[in-house]
């Protein structure tokens, strides 16, 4: 972001047009239809989490601030994936996180105002891996060889902008996972990340290029 003052203005709840660019994290959506105050109606929030990606189109939840209903209303619209993968380290073990996966994805989609889903591996399974307590290198070898304690999950997410880009104000969609990660980091830095899942780390990663073909 070229304009250095944008970091001071990110949390001022006023539209600063010079800062409303992807590089400047859209001025925290302050220039965007009521800005940050446009959140999912608390009356609908629980309902929209319950019905997120449930296979039924709920128009009341099919809004950016409610997470686009998990794309239930967009099955006929082709996917438009942002570049890269959003990688979150969440301090909840995988089985616990997956139990509340719809709520997790709905809330994160609402924060980023676009659609998120788990990246799938070659076997069609969600890419949610155990995150182990980092062990100090000074520990005795025998201690280190015990199964390390799982204290969280490493979660790989895809960003699908198909509805974000269709919305009237479509200039705020994250073009890549890194810009979404930067936005979450900025929210966290100014203590405005209203997300009940404890995040340890957020980053964007490029997709691995395809394996080079082996010459015959």
């Amino acid at each position: 972001c070229e304009a250095l003052q944008c970091w001071r203005l990110f949390n001022n709840s006023r539209c600063d047009p010079a800062c409303s660019s992807p590089a400047c994290l859209y001025d925290n959506f302050d220039c965007h239809a009521g800005g940050r105050e446009r959140t999912c109606n608390p009356v609908y929030e629980k309902y929209c989490a319950d019905h997120f990606a449930d296979g039924r189109c709920d128009q009341g939840c099919n809004t950016e601030e409610c997470g686009w209903d998990g794309l239930d209303c967009a099955s006929e619209v082709p996917a438009l994936l942002a570049r890269g993968v959003l990688v979150l380290t969440v301090l909840l073990p995988p089985e616990e996180l997956l139990r509340s996966s719809a709520d997790f994805l709905q809330r994160l989609s609402a924060i980023l105002r676009t659609s998120l889903r788990f990246r799938l591996d070659a076997h069609g399974q969600a890419m949610v891996f155990p995150y182990h307590r980092p062990s100090p290198g000074s520990e005795p070898r025998a201690r280190r060889e015990l199964a390390p304690e799982v204290i969280g999950s490493v979660v790989m997410l895809e960003i699908d902008n198909r509805l974000c880009l269709q919305s009237p104000e479509n200039d705020h969609c994250f073009p890549d996972a890194q810009s979404a990660a930067d936005y979450l980091g900025a929210l966290s830095a100014v203590e405005r990340l209203d997300f009940p899942y404890p995040l340890r780390d957020v980053r964007g990663e490029p997709l691995e290029p395809p394996e080079p073909s082996v010459p015959l």
């Epitope: 296979g55 189109c57 209303c73 996180l97 997956l98 994805l105 788990f118 969600a126 895809e158």
Partner: antibody, heavy 119, light 107 residues
């Protein structure tokens, strides 16, 4: 064409286990939410549970009478939905249907498989 | 859990009759109400979704109305193939629940 075929039903003793399968064809199974519904002989329909697509965590929800005893899972590589039933009771005797939920309500149901729990 | 209560539990009618079946939810379910038809030995068939929307391929003599807690399925002119059991179902909150069914028999 779009089709769901249940299998795995049969006679089992109370306390026993059974795994039902639902083979899907004619559509992209991996993207759909899938349900199990049952119907005891001569009785009404009862929702058993559902499972979301793996891209949304593959999380399952259950009706109270089966929670903790039944597990819904899916294998997208085999286009198959499963219902693992443990600690079966006589009141679990029913025809079990799998069904596909669809945003535009083009629902699809299987023909059902009969599970009889009796000593 | 949301309880769904259908009435009547059974009715006798003649071909050409207008038939009305009601369904009441124990709490508001907005318009998250579906109607199914089931014939003996067959899987249920969706007739009406979201309280009033006719499923494609279903004859226009079937209609649904209502919102909140009270809903109605109407068959404007009963045909021989309509003799079956009808169920309402809410999909507002899990666990999804069905009414106990209404059996429509020939008078």
């Amino acid at each position: 064409q779009v089709q769901l075929v249940e299998s795995g039903g049969g006679l089992v003793k109370p306390g026993g286990s059974l795994r039902l399968s639902c083979a899907a064809s004619g559509f992209t199974f991996s993207t759909y939410v899938m349900h199990w519904v049952r119907q005891a002989p001569g009785k009404g329909l009862e929702w058993v549970g559902r499972i979301r697509a793996n891209a949304y965590g593959g999380a399952a929800d259950y009706a109270a009478p089966v929670k903790g005893r039944f597990t819904i899972s899916r294998d997208d590589s085999k286009n198959t939905l499963y219902l693992q039933m443990n600690s079966l009771k006589t009141e679990d005797t029913a025809v079990y249907y799998c069904a596909r939920a669809e945003a535009r309500y083009r629902d699809v149901w299987g023909q059902g498989t009969l599970v009889t729990v009796s000593s | 859990d949301i309880q769904m209560t259908q009435s009547p539990s059974s009715l006798s009618a003649s071909v050409g009759d207008r038939v009305t079946i009601t369904c009441r939810a124990s709490q508001s379910i907005s318009s998250h109400l579906n109607w199914y038809q089931q014939k003996p030995g067959k899987a249920p068939k969706l007739l009406i979704y979201a309280a009033s929307n006719l499923q494609s391929g279903v004859p226009s003599r079937f209609s649904g109305s209502g919102s909140g807690t009270d809903f109605t399925l109407t068959i404007s002119s009963l045909q021989p193939e309509d003799f079956a059991t009808y169920y309402c179902q809410q999909d507002y909150h899990t666990p999804f629940t069905f009414g106990q069914g209404t059996k429509v028999e020939i008078k």
